[in-house]
Interface confidence: medium
């Protein structure tokens, strides 16, 4: 029963991670620019995402513009887009694999095969978590590098947007959930059903570490 609980917890975490990842990819808040005047904040904030950029006025009005040409976009933005979409699709595939092998489904009857499918889904979720982490970390690295680069003019300096934090959360949840699903499965590949059941009844929850924490900093 403990393993079933871990499985459910694992899949819930991965589902939360997937939703977070979807929101992170969709929201135009990867990079944020707060235009600062000499002593006052100018009433304009620019949000930049993977698909569009938005200008938010102090009145609350927001104007968004979808990026026109795919080919005209910077390569790192194209790569981030691709990785985001791939990560979401990989996680969906992981979910399908999990459903095929879940304890409560009858797609696969043999317990050992089910265990292997759950393990596979866990690995797929971990891969999805890593794929989510890459564009988020890459973008954050570029933002921080430019922020501290004395050759970069102020208009080109950016801050970390909410989408990046959502992306880190998504990656963490996918890695954690995937890790839990991997931990609920037997280590051997071809043991009989009796070993499988014994392993399940005695398995203790693995201590799973979340993603490494990023130092938070006030940039403005």
């Amino acid at each position: 029963m403990a393993s079933a609980g871990m499985q459910i917890l694992g899949v819930v975490l991965t589902l939360l991670g997937w939703v977070n990842g979807l929101v992170s990819c969709a929201l135009p808040m990867w990079k944020v620019t707060a235009f600062i005047g000499n002593s006052i904040v100018v009433a304009q904030v620019v949000w930049e995402g993977l698909w569009m950029s938005c200008v938010v006025q102090s009145t609350g009005q927001m104007q968004c513009k979808v990026y026109d040409s795919l080919l005209a976009l910077p390569q790192d933005l194209q790569a981030a887009r691709a990785l985001c979409v791939i990560a979401l699709l990989v996680a969906l595939f992981g979910l399908l694999v999990y459903l095929a092998g879940a304890k409560c489904t009858t797609c696969v009857e043999e317990k050992d095969s089910k265990a292997r499918l759950v393990l596979t889904s866990g690995i797929v979720f971990v891969i999805s978590g890593v794929l989510t982490l890459i564009p988020v970390c890459w973008t954050a690295h570029a933002i921080i590098r430019d922020f501290y680069n004395p050759l970069v003019a102020e208009a080109q300096k950016r801050e970390l947007g909410a989408s990046l934090y959502l992306g880190w959360a998504a990656s963490g949840l996918l890695l954690l959930g995937g890790g839990l699903l991997c931990c609920t499965c037997p280590s051997g590949g071809s043991q009989g059903p009796s070993h499988y059941m014994a392993r399940y009844s005695t398995s203790a929850p693995a201590i799973s570490r979340g993603p490494s924490e990023y130092p938070t900093k006030n940039y403005v």
């Epitope: 235009f35 600062i36 005047g37 000499n38 100018v42 680069n149 004395p150 050759l151 970069v152 003019a153 102020e154 208009a155 080109q156």
Partner: antibody, heavy 120, light 107 residues
Framework: EVQLVQSGAEVKKPGESLRISCKTS????????MHWVRQMPGKSLEWMGG????????HYNQKFQGHVTISVDKSISTAYLQWSSLKASDTAMYYC?????????????WGAGTLVTVSS | DIQMTQSPSSLSASVGDRVTITCQAS??????LAWYQQKPGKVPKLLIS???SLETGVPSRFSGSGSGKDYTFTISSLQPEDIATYYC?????????FGGGTKVEIK
């Protein structure tokens, strides 16, 4: 006393290569980024690009990207501007100027300039 | 790129006159503006940064004002040693760009 001493005037033919220098003294070299500014005869000033002497990162004006190379030798506190193939349109006065590392991007001190003449 | 339009391109005034030079950016530069003086055959010298802040050692007859896209440089009482070309420069956005310059002469 802060000094940005530039190399002497150069007369070159189109297609030739050239490297001009800007030797600095009187301040901590790594506390300022070094930049090059072009002034064509009778014209205004144009920022060409700059370099961070701490990590050798460069930032170019797109107009000059690929045509010139900016470099530094930290050991002798000197900045360089280099062309691999000069054109007649490169005839101008070239100034090196510094920008405070932790400040805004304006030039607080300039070299005396190097006149480059490219003529066949 | 941000275009800096400086006017007039040249002016002639008498000693003691008030001289005003304007600089207009093609977009808002959020007070990230510097003014330089270049005397004939000499190197540019920084006079003002942040649109209004006078650099150390610069005479108080020089001043700067403005915001948004429009900025003004003023010499309250023109002196013979002020004969020079004056340039504005924006440092809000890369590439850093200069105005076309204003040549100031004595009548």
């Amino acid at each position: 006393e802060v000094q940005l001493v530039q190399s002497g005037a150069e007369v070159k033919k189109p297609g030739e290569s050239l490297r001009i220098s800007c030797k600095t003294s009187g301040y901590t070299f790594t506390e300022y980024t070094m930049h090059w500014v072009r002034q064509m005869p009778g014209k205004s000033l144009e920022w060409m690009g700059g370099i961070d002497p701490n990590n050798f990162n460069t930032h170019y004006n797109q107009k000059f990207q690929g045509h010139v190379t900016i470099s530094v030798d930290k050991s002798i506190s000197t900045a360089y501007l280099q062309w691999s193939s000069l054109k007649a349109s490169d005839t101008a006065m070239y100034y090196c100027a510094r920008i405070y590392y932790f400040g805004r991007l304006y030039f607080d001190f300039w070299g005396a300039g190097t006149l480059v003449t490219v003529s066949s | 790129d941000i275009q800096m339009t400086q006017s007039p391109s040249s002016l002639s005034a008498s000693v003691g006159d008030r001289v005003t030079i304007t600089c207009q950016a093609s977009e808002d530069i959020y007070n990230r503006l510097a003014w330089y003086q270049q005397k004939p055959g000499k190197v540019p010298k920084l006079l003002i940064s942040g649109a209004t802040s006078l650099e150390t050692g610069v005479p108080s007859r020089f001043s700067g004002s403005g915001s948004g896209k429009d900025y003004t440089f003023t010499i309250s009482s023109l002196q013979p040693e002020d004969i020079a070309t004056y340039y504005c420069q924006q440092y809000w956005s890369a590439p850093l760009t200069f105005g076309g310059g204003t040549k100031v002469e004595i009548k």
